[in-house]
Interface confidence: medium
Amino acid sequence: RTVPPMVNVTCSEVSEGNITVTCRASSFYPRNITLTWRQDGVSLSHNTQQWGDVLPDGNGTYQTWVATRIRQGEEQRFTCYMEHSGNHGTHPVPSGKVLALQSQW
């Protein structure tokens, strides 16, 4: 069976004009998943991203996340790239006062 992930992108303010953007994938199966931040379509280097492990979410499916810190005002340059069971998609950082974007694919 294949259950595609729900993707949720959030922003949280941090100091000195930087923000942390977090991309969460949840409710997916099987466990193997690609999750990374891209800037202008290019994957960020590994040491600029932080990942959570892929863990059970209690419903027979899995969840994980990736986060990175970016300059405030540059949100439109960043997307979260997801690949799972042959499907893939990119999810933008929400702009303005909207702090979350959720999509099912």
């Epitope: 193997n32 690609t34 999750l35 990374t36 994957s43 590994h46 991203q49 990942w51 492990d53 892929v54 863990l55 059970p56 990736v66 790239y81 690949e83 042959g86």
Partner: antibody, heavy 119, light 108 residues
Framework: QVQLKQSGPGLVQPSQSLSITCIVS????????VHWVRQSPGKGLEWLGM???????DYNAAFISRLSINKDNSKSQVFLKMNSLQADDTGIYYC?????????????WGQGTSVTVSS | QILLTQSPAILSASLGERVTMTCTAS???????LHWYQQKPGSSPKLWIY???NLASGVPARFSGGGSGTSYSLTVSNMEAEDAATYYC?????????FGSGTKLEIK
């Protein structure tokens, strides 16, 4: 820095079991998973199985009946036990850290435990 | 399981030469999950290239990787003595995760 140090016997009798301990430092087993891989002249590199941060395990179907992987987070130790060893189980056994994120590559390897199965 | 076939088994190259080795998968592998490791005699393998084309930390820029689907390659643009080693491809696309049999790169 990240290190995986292995200990275990070099010689195992046929039909007996193999136990190897992998002690990790520089990272936490609550943050990273660990693979076990072996290397032999006849079969090359073979993935045996892995343990995730939450303690769940995935095994290569070819070994699932005689392999178990466990860990002790507080002691930063991962354990491999393989039963019913035969001559073709001779090889070097590695514990390997599972890289994070979008690539899941095996990013740090232990020094290996050389195992000979012989009477 | 996915079989990875590496060729050639042994690759002899002169210093300064450009060399390419290949890894062919028996079924399609996502480029995100195709990795390369370098191993020298008496040492453990080291992560060398991850996700087809990304160099691991400390790997010289003369190395590059490419490919998609069932066909992948590792290239050394300017062979140096320290590059002599065995290189293994590896797929994390589908369990059981598998490795190629290796290409031994040696100095001619």
């Amino acid at each position: 820095q990240v290190q995986l140090k292995q200990s275990g016997p070099g010689l195992v009798q046929p039909s007996q079991s193999l136990s190897i301990t992998c002690i990790v430092s520089g990272f936490s087993l609550t943050t990273y998973g660990v693979h076990w891989v072996r290397q032999s002249p006849g079969k090359g590199l073979e993935w045996l199985g892995m343990i995730w941060t939450d303690g769940t395990t995935d095994y290569n179907a070819a070994f699932i009946s005689r392999l178990s992987i466990n860990k002790d987070n507080s002691k930063s130790q991962v354990f491999l036990k393989m039963n019913s060893l035969q001559a073709d189980d001779t090889g070097i056994y590695y514990c390997v850290r599972k890289g994070h994120g979008y690539y899941y590559a095996m990013d740090y390897w232990g020094q290996g435990t050389s195992v000979t199965v012989s009477s | 399981q996915i079989l990875l076939t590496q060729s050639p088994a042994i690759l002899s190259a002169s210093l300064g030469e450009r060399v390419t080795m290949t890894c062919t998968a028996s079924s399609s592998v996502s480029s995100s999950y195709l990795h390369w490791y370098q191993q020298k005699p008496g040492s453990s393998p080291k992560l060398w290239i991850y996700s087809t084309s990304n160099l691991a930390s400390g790997v010289p820029a003369r190395f590059s990787g490419g490919g998609s689907g069932t066909s992948y390659s590792l290239t050394v643009s300017n062979m140096e003595a320290e590059d002599a080693a065995t290189y293994y491809c590896h797929q994390y696309h589908r369990s059981p995760f598998t490795f190629g049999s290796g290409t031994k790169l040696e100095i001619k």
